[in-house]
Interface confidence: low
């Protein structure tokens, strides 16, 4: 039975050219996290594996940095980075937990962070 929940940074916005940290946190479960995948729609950005460490997809190596923690830092943001991002926790024995973050990259300086929220 899957008892865990994923807390994410929720809906966030950032300025073009800036950086943003995508964060997810898995709680309320004793399952072992074997790997975390970070994905943007259908593209895999990075993996953090319990045995293999961090690996950034070659397509994103210039603009994606691992961490902090199991989070992911996006750099040199462009308007094209606007969209949904997913943290996918592969755990044993529970299975897969998925968190969703929506990022909006703004041209202006009115970017501000949204509230945190829970995904059951």
């Amino acid at each position: 039975m899957m008892t865990g929940t994923i807390e994410t940074t929720g809906n966030i916005s950032a300025e073009k050219g800036g950086s943003i940290i995508l964060q997810c946190h898995l709680s309320s479960t004793t399952a072992q996290v074997t790997q975390v995948n970070w994905e943007q729609q259908d593209q895999l950005l990075a993996i953090c594996n319990a045995d293999l460490g961090w690996h950034i997809s070659p397509s994103f190596k210039d603009r994606v940095a691992p961490g902090p923690g199991l989070g992911l830092t996006l750099q040199s943001l462009t308007v094209n980075d606007t969209g949904e991002y997913f943290c996918i926790y592969h755990t044993y024995p529970d299975g897969t937990y998925t968190g969703r973050i929506f990022l909006e990259v703004l041209e202006s300086s009115v970017a501000e962070h949204g509230a945190r929220f829970q995904i059951p």
Epitope: Q35, L44, I47, I56
Partner: nanobody, 120 residues
Framework: EVQLVESGGGLVQAGGSLRLSCAAS????????MGWFRQAPGKEREGVAT????????YYADSVKGRFTISADNAKNTVYLQMNSLKPEDTAVYYC?????????????WGQGTQVTVSS
Amino acid sequence: EVQLVESGGGLVQAGGSLRLSCAASGRTLDDYVMGWFRQAPGKEREGVATISGGGDTTYYADSVKGRFTISADNAKNTVYLQMNSLKPEDTAVYYCAAVPWRWTTRRDYWGQGTQVTVSS
């Protein structure tokens, strides 16, 4: 299907060097994270070093940082582990592993292992 064949193990004195090779056949390495793992008698298998298919992202266990170097030759579909300043505690069977980017299980393709013995 990926077949992995390791070579380069042997007996070496403490402070010496060895270079392990892992030749892969069946698939290009571009789609894989390649790793070296080791297992000493009576101990669990542990990750030593990994490298992404593009060769630009590497990870090292703390116990080998600064002494071991992982590299890949994609043209030859071969991954290398250069081991310098070897210590008796590096004695183990060394295994090569290939893990696809969308890894969701604990293990994938493994070689048969090559013995490394470091004498004092």
